[in-house]
Amino acid sequence: GCLTQLYENAFFRGGDVASMYTPNAQYCQMRCTFHPRCLLFSFLPASSINDMEKRFGCFLKDSVTGTLPKVHRTGAVSGHSLKQCGHQISACHRDIYKGVDMRGVNFNVSKVSSVEECQKRCTSNIRCQFFSYATQTFHKAEYRNNCLLKYSPGGTPTAIKVLSNVESGFSLKPCALSEIGCHMNIFQHLAFSDVDVARVLTPDAFVCRTICTYHPNCLFFTFYTNVWKIESQRNVCLLKTSESGTPSSSTPQENTISGYSLLTCKRTLPEPCHSKIYPGVDFGGEELNVTFVKGVNVCQETCTKMIRCQFFTYSLLPEDCKEEKCKCFLRLSMDGSPTRIAYGTQGSSGYSLRLCNTGDNSVCTTKTSTRIVGGTNSSWGEWPWQVSLQVKLTAQRHLCGGSLIGHQWVLTAAHCFDGLPLQDVWRIYSGILNLSDITKDTPFSQIKEIIIHQNYKVSEGNHDIALIKLQAPLNYTEFQKPICLPSKGDTSTIYTNCWVTGWGFSKEKGEIQNILQKVNIPLVTNEECQKRYQDYKITQRMVCAGYKEGGKDACKGDSGGPLVCKHNGMWRLVGITSWGEGCARREQPGVYTKVAEYMDWILEKTQSSDGKAQMQSPA
């Protein structure tokens, strides 16, 4: 299953499959997730080690048993790959690292006014993988405001150095934010020239293209089909690059297929997995396990659930079957691709779905009247769980926020439905940033069921929570995916990085905002919060957030939206925007429904009709 916990001051001994430099543990974890063999990782922050060569070291590890012995190492951080973690799987990494220079091949330098602009330039340059920016206070005047675009053979820095007044980060192309755009076309009977960066075996050009998309240096590819004239080159997928970023030449060639990486696509990237099953095909590789199962789909599920399994072959040979079950061969290789592909067999083959980010039809959890005042504009994909609940009567207007917690589930505030309990009048917009982008053609979700907490009473602050079941499940993308829920009765976690988002009023007597706003707000203890509300009881089912001096808060139109906190690199839905005395008033924190206190209720209500819990637990 999915394991999200991080181990502080711990280092996994042995099992090394690769090492690299990464700026933090979360990026190291992401590299582990996308490495075909990596199950575990250990990261050494700069503060944890004197050896300059090992600072920022990210060590990717494999283990036949799925675990390795942990040794104590002060400052080290270890953890698990996020394979099998559904929507948490993403190659997108937005963080900017202050005081850090990520080294690589500097291929472009320009003057820019901010680190955000530098990141944007990197995202819009086809070859840029990461960048460094010298701030206005950099010690050498001639380098100030320099934006260095970089790449490296592995896509990660060749070294990371602590350097004052330098800020570094990664391209946001994996966040589907590139302005370059992409070529979706597949070119039949055409071979591209230029530099081969890798060679793998794939059953078709589409798998080849997805591998190219997620390979750090692949810009385009050529695939040799299973009827290519040279037998040893059949099913070979050549991943390619060039100085210019495009093929310098292409040659008409029977039984070849070429195309481009989709990493520069805007708004949608392919999933980093291959779900198709190939009948009459055998995939060769190292044997992991053989099991008897009923049907090829069960074989694929078995492979997906066995975390080390990369691909499988389901054999229909009479000697491999007994009764209705046949042999399911679970296999792996060094690069995640088959070492041999054979056609015209009595087998069916396919890949593990462990890197599919749609996950199952579930809401995500972890084991372990009001708008935004004083906020700033959000950017695309920053809060992909945020939805806009709109009412269409004569006109259409935004009324509340909500949080996507599963393919078919939105969590919001019960008071959003005061006086508007009819599900037909509601439209739910997901994957949007600007309300002005909504036109009559913009797709929206309709409500199948509104489930208001049974103890909620109209115009009271208690039990202000409601679930919305959507008529049809939503697909997950970089811009539309769920937020993880906290564990039941989560009281031990101290959250220090919390944000409220919404399109609500930007002042008490204001108006709905066009661009989704965000504001960083500290949590306030219930005891402190209670002192600020002389008339109202702040219960253990509520959580408060706000600044002593006011100025930043949720407001009208933000109700039902998320209060999210980042802990160990993972965002969790801590609160639902509920109520407050005015907006952003001094000494009047916002009051939010505490989601952890309602986990039993959420789990009970999101159970499917067949009794299967719709709740996936990545921890």
């Epitope: 009271e460 002192k531 509300y533 002389q534 008339d535 009881k537 000494e587």
Partner: antibody, heavy 116, light 106 residues
Framework: EVQLQQSGAELVKPGASVRLSCTAS????????IFWVKQRPKQGLEWIGR????????KYDPKIQGKATLTADTSSNTAYLQLSSLTSEDSAIYYC?????????WGQGTLVSVSA | DIQMTQSPSSLSTSLGGKVTITCEAS??????IAWYQHKPGKGPRLLIH???TLQSGIPSRFSGSGSGKDYSFSISNLEPEDIATYYC????????FGGGTKLEIK
């Protein structure tokens, strides 16, 4: 309209116990805290304690601990103050109040007289 | 335990005039002070909380100020219905009332 109706005056003997009631209307006591405050003749106000009727959690003034017991019955929307081992020092008006962080609305008070 | 020393214990003033009552806490109470008006035969009435925030429906003739350990409460343009006993209350750590100030008209 928010109201707190307190029970009538009590004349009790030293050493005895008494139970005072505070019945709420216009709101549900589960949604608030009920506080109790004492006022001795010609003296100031003293906080006795607080109950959360939703879960019966109580908090008392450490000086009064043992003397007073707070309870609540949500079905009748009523809170109670039980005073035990009464002495002349317990002769006072006892007020119930509702609120969150503070005593926002008060009852009219119940006079308890302890006399042989 | 936080003690609240309220002064004066009584004061006499003219209608239309202004009165000021002070309360000193034994420790810093972080502005968590409230002021109540108490008339005989009734329950006290909350006037001000968090040092200076007027409870809804309370006229602006009533005001409060202070910080740390020292706080004051004022009534300007005194009216006949203001005749009552006034109490301060700290709610930073549990609850402690001041001794009260009895306000009379000359």
């Amino acid at each position: 309209e928010v109201q707190l109706q307190q029970s009538g005056a009590e004349l009790v003997k030293p050493g005895a116990s008494v139970r005072l009631s505070c019945t709420a209307s216009g709101f549900n006591i589960k949604d608030t805290y009920i506080f109790w405050v004492k006022q001795r003749p010609k003296q100031g106000l003293e906080w006795i304690g607080r109950i959360d009727p939703e879960n019966d959690n109580t908090k008392y003034d450490p000086k009064i601990q043992g003397k007073a017991t707070l309870t609540a019955d949500t079905s009748s929307n009523t809170a109670y103050l039980q005073l035990s081992s009464l002495t002349s020092e317990d002769s006072a008006i006892y007020y119930c109040a509702k609120g969150g962080g503070l005593f926002a609305y008060w009852g009219q008070g119940t006079l308890v007289s302890v006399s042989a | 335990d936080i003690q609240m020393t309220q002064s004066p214990s009584s004061l006499s003033t003219s209608l239309g005039g202004k009165v000021t009552i002070t309360c000193e806490a034994s420790h810093d109470i972080n502005n968590y002070i409230a002021w109540y008006q108490h008339k005989p035969g009734k329950g006290p009435r909350l006037l001000i909380h968090y040092t200076s925030t007027l409870q809804s429906g309370i006229p602006s003739r009533f005001s409060g100020s202070g910080s740390g350990k020292d706080y004051s409460f004022s009534i300007s343009n005194l009216e006949p219905e203001d005749i009552a006993t006034y109490y301060c209350l700290q709610y930073d750590n549990l609850f402690t009332f001041g001794g009260g100030t009895k306000l009379e008209i000359k």
